[in-house]
């Protein structure tokens, strides 16, 4: 595949990555799948600077990111190391709260109103953000 050199239409370029901000909601798994079909992934926040950029674009709305612990430990969808990486949880989060009555705990992370993170029930239909790296080889065949 060819290397992507500019962002697709309706995506926002920032620091060699492209971001797409949904205006509707999906369950985490559906949002994750949507991004994959766009040759992207749910946003992975690796710095305070990236956090502020995403926060500015989503506004005060619960929004999914590419972080989950559905298989045990917390993991970023692109393989970025969670333990040593950037974190911005709200106080006392994540708490894997079971009291919501929807079944199970809370295994998916989202941005809250003030940008800090919370874990919530993965089936809630929150907005989401896709990200893809400009330097990454795209899946599209090169133009002949």
């Amino acid at each position: 595949g060819s290397e992507r050199t500019c962002c697709p239409v309706n995506w926002v370029e920032h620091e060699r990555s492209c971001y797409w901000f949904s205006r509707s909601g999906k369950a985490w798994a559906d949002a994750d799948n949507y991004c994959r079909l766009e040759d992207a992934h749910l946003v992975v926040v690796t710095s305070w600077e990236e956090q502020k950029f995403v926060q500015h674009h989503i506004g005060p709305v619960n929004t999914w990111m590419g972080l989950h612990d559905q298989n045990g430990p917390w993991k970023w969808v692109d393989g970025t190391d969670y333990e040593t990486g950037f974190k911005n949880w709200r106080p006392e989060q994540p708490d894997d709260w079971y009291g919501h009555g929807l079944g199970g705990g809370e295994d998916c992370a989202h941005f809250t109103d003030d940008g800090r993170w919370n874990d919530d029930v993965c089936q809630r239909p929150y907005r989401w953000v896709c990200e893809t790296e400009l330097d990454k080889a795209s899946q599209e065949p090169p133009l002949l």
Partner: antibody, heavy 123, light 112 residues
Framework: QVQLVESGGGVVQPGRSLRLSCAAS????????MHWVRQAPGKGLEWVTI????????YYADSVKGRFAISRDNSKNTLYLQMNSLRAEDTAVYYC????????????????WGQGTTVTVSS | DIVMTQTPLSLSVTPGQPASISCKSS???????????LYWYLQKPGQPPQLLIY???NRFPGVSDRFSGSGSGTDFTLKISRVEAEDVGVYYC?????????FGQGTKVEIK
């Protein structure tokens, strides 16, 4: 304008079935989770059930679990409540209501309600 | 289930005077996202309920600024600064942090 109109209520004998409908207009129905809430004569409000915007998830009050089924047809902008094995205590006005304020946040309360349809279960 | 308890159950108010309704929940309504999921509804005679206040203190668009909501955790209050004739009806609090959604028993407000 935003409107919800319930229909299908009536008098039914205990043990029988009834299907309620709620026709939505004036908003993008397929973007909203939808509730049924009921109110027995002279009593307060009781939440009955919710369905996700795409029908993928449904939850019920214990009092109706296994007897009532919520469904929706987004192509027809219509919400349904199939009520089976009806009991006298199911007698109530049934309201449909949409998740409000932000359609993509189901912690939200209900912001728009229909006028209700009356179900009477009596022999 | 979360139990919502309202007091008083009825209230008779002189027009122009303030009124206050209390709602207590059996569990905290503060969610991990920092919001507190408590709602206030008014059901006028012969009508469906209408949303007044969402997430504890936010007035729903079109609702008079005579209505205000406050509180945190398990204790909440709805205040009407100056009661008018059109405010008569039954007021309900409701929580949405846990399924099932649950309502208070209702507070009937009438004009003296």
């Amino acid at each position: 304008q935003v409107q919800l109109v319930e229909s299908g209520g009536g008098v039914v004998q205990p043990g029988r079935s009834l299907r309620l409908s709620c026709a939505a207009s004036g908003f993008t129905f397929s973007a909203y989770g939808m509730h049924w809430v009921r109110q027995a004569p002279g009593k307060g409000l009781e939440w009955v059930t919710i369905i996700w915007y795409d029908g993928s998830y449904k939850y019920y009050a214990d009092s109706v679990k296994g007897r009532f089924a919520i469904s929706r047809d987004n192509s027809k902008n219509t919400l349904y409540l199939q009520m089976n094995s009806l009991r006298a205590e199911d007698t109530a006005v049934y309201y449909c209501a949409r998740t409000g304020v932000d359609p993509w946040d189901y912690y939200n309360g209900m912001d728009v309600w229909g006028q209700g349809t009356t179900v009477t279960v009596s022999s | 289930d979360i139990v919502m308890t309202q007091t008083p159950l009825s209230l008779s108010v002189t027009p122009g005077q303030p009124a206050s309704i209390s709602c207590k929940s059996s569990q905290s309504l503060l969610h991990g996202d920092g919001k507190t999921y408590l709602y206030w509804y008014l059901q006028k005679p012969g009508q469906p309920p209408q949303l007044l206040i969402y997430a504890t203190s936010n007035r729903f668009p079109g609702v008079s600024d005579r209505f205000s909501g406050s509180g945190s955790g398990t204790d909440f209050t709805l205040k009407i600064s100056r009661v008018e004739a059109e405010d008569v009806g039954v007021y309900y609090c409701m929580q949405s942090i846990q399924v099932p959604w649950t309502f208070g028993q209702g507070t009937k407000v009438e004009i003296k």
